[in-house]
Interface confidence: medium
């Protein structure tokens, strides 16, 4: 699986999850988030050669088409597969609020 | 929606579905498919600016991060959203077989 366990331990050029730290205030302008100050959102990148973690029959077809037509712009793309939520703390006036934001952290990638 | 109705009628530079005809024999080497000879598989391509058909909170976050850090390699990617099956005819010996291959035709795209 193209997950953090594999990708963070290997120098993988092809589609894999990569570490990316995002500071809420500096990188997003989300000044309301009190904690955490930032988090590892991660991202997916890298080429998708034929059959690499193909998501659908279409991505398999496109990967094969691309090997035979390497100059073509049509090729599968490395995108998130499994995502996890992130719990944030913010304040409404002086009242602390805890909220879970869904699909915030990429745990694995696929070729789609 | 970034679907064939919209994308095939407009000169859209950003993420959209694009027409792509694939000949089973010439482009994939699939000699076993008798009918059709080929089909419009289509594909997704184009930049994913902030909030363009964002698939998840993560793709929204990544798009926003990318507006402030345009040089960063971390950005959402234009990939298939809705796919449709394709019915094919092939032979096992002299016996014709009809099969529906799932997720073969891209009908719309998203930024993921």
């Amino acid at each position: 699986a193209l997950d953090t366990n594999y990708c963070f331990r290997n120098l993988e050029e092809n589609c894999c999850v990569r570490p990316l730290y995002i500071d809420f205030r500096q990188d997003l302008g989300w000044k309301w988030v009190h904690e955490p100050k930032g988090y590892y959102a991660n991202f997916c990148s890298g080429p998708c050669p034929y059959l690499r973690s193909a998501d659908t029959t279409h991505s398999t077809v496109l990967g094969l088409y691309n090997t035979l037509n390497p100059e073509a712009s049509a090729s599968p793309c490395c995108v998130p597969q499994d995502l996890e939520p992130l719990t944030i703390l913010y304040y409404v006036g002086r009242t602390p609020k805890v909220e879970q934001l869904s699909n915030m952290v990429v745990k694995s990638c696929k070729c789609s | 929606a970034l679907d064939t109705n919209y994308c095939f009628r407009n000169l859209e530079e950003n993420c959209c579905v694009r027409p792509l005809y694939i000949d089973f024999r010439q482009d994939l080497g699939w000699k076993w498919v008798h009918e059709p000879k080929g089909y419009y598989a289509n594909f997704c391509s184009g930049p994913c600016p902030y909030l363009r058909s964002a698939d998840t909170t993560h793709s929204t976050v990544l798009g926003l991060y990318n507006t402030l850090n345009p040089e960063a390699s971390a950005s959402p990617c234009c990939v298939p959203q809705d796919l449709e099956p394709l019915t094919i005819l092939y032979y096992v010996g002299r016996t014709p077989k009809v099969e529906q291959l799932s997720n073969m035709v891209v009908k719309s795209c998203k930024c993921s």
Epitope: W30, W32, Y90 | L68
Partner: antibody, heavy 121, light 110 residues
């Protein structure tokens, strides 16, 4: 504590113009500072913000490339890079309600009186 | 992104009456909302922050409420001095936005 804008005047289209917001009674390094404009008879239009401490800036999507914000210890500048007639408005600077990181999350409690920019050939 | 839609554009109210102004965000702003009052030729004045907290020196007849994407400013016991234009502003984020302010509501006091 007060804010005063200056630099507004009549300019010809395409002539760069810099507006200055001067703060009194507090340190700009501790507060988020924004520029907001208002065309005659129209609503409030946010241009951007410069954060206290880090000095990092955010601009409205329509304002990127058209405006540049910078600051010193006592002033915040807004440069209109190439004014058009669409930029004719009163320009206000505004301070976040609270000091420290994210202090503008509770709105802008201190505003200048505004400075008028007229663009005409 | 985080577009603010304010309604109505204009409202007429009698002295002593109650007026309600609504503000809708295109996505959740987690109570990150401020309200301002502006009279002609004057600078805006902060009335309410964090959706419901009254700014310093603001009379208690001004009340803010709401959460998520829907917010309301209510002025009860309206006085002549309340004739002004009122604006909402999302304060959740500065990133990737067009304008954090709503279009404004003109309150006319009869």
């Amino acid at each position: 504590q007060s804010l005063e804008e200056s630099g507004g005047r009549l300019v010809t289209p395409g002539t760069p113009l810099t507006l200055t917001c001067t703060a009194s009674g507090f340190s700009l390094s501790s507060y988020d500072m924004s520029w907001v404009r208002q065309a005659p008879g129209k609503g409030l239009e946010w241009i951007g913000i410069i954060y206290g401490g880090s000095g990092s800036t955010w601009y409205a999507s329509w304002a990127k490339g058209r405006f540049t914000m910078s600051k010193t210890s006592t002033t915040v500048d807004l440069k209109i890079t190439s004014p058009t007639t669409e930029d004719m408005a009163t320009y206000f600077c505004a301070r976040g309600r609270d000091g420290g990181a994210g202090g503008s999350r509770n709105g802008y409690s201190l505003w200048g009186q505004g400075t008028l920019v007229t663009v005409s050939s | 992104a985080y577009d603010m839609t304010q309604t109505p554009a204009s409202v007429e109210v009698a002295v002593g009456g109650t007026v309600t102004i609504k503000c809708q965000a295109s996505e959740s702003i987690y109570s990150g909302l401020a309200w301002y009052q502006q009279t002609p030729g004057q600078r805006p004045k902060l009335l309410i922050y964090a959706a419901s907290d009254l700014a310093s020196g603001v009379p208690s007849r001004f009340k803010g409420s709401g959460s998520g994407t829907e917010y309301t400013l209510t002025i009860s016991g309206v006085e002549c001095a309340d004739a002004a234009t009122y604006y909402c502003q999302q304060t959740w984020t500065d990133g990737g936005i067009d304008n954090p302010f709503g279009g404004g509501t003109e309150v006319v006091v009869k």
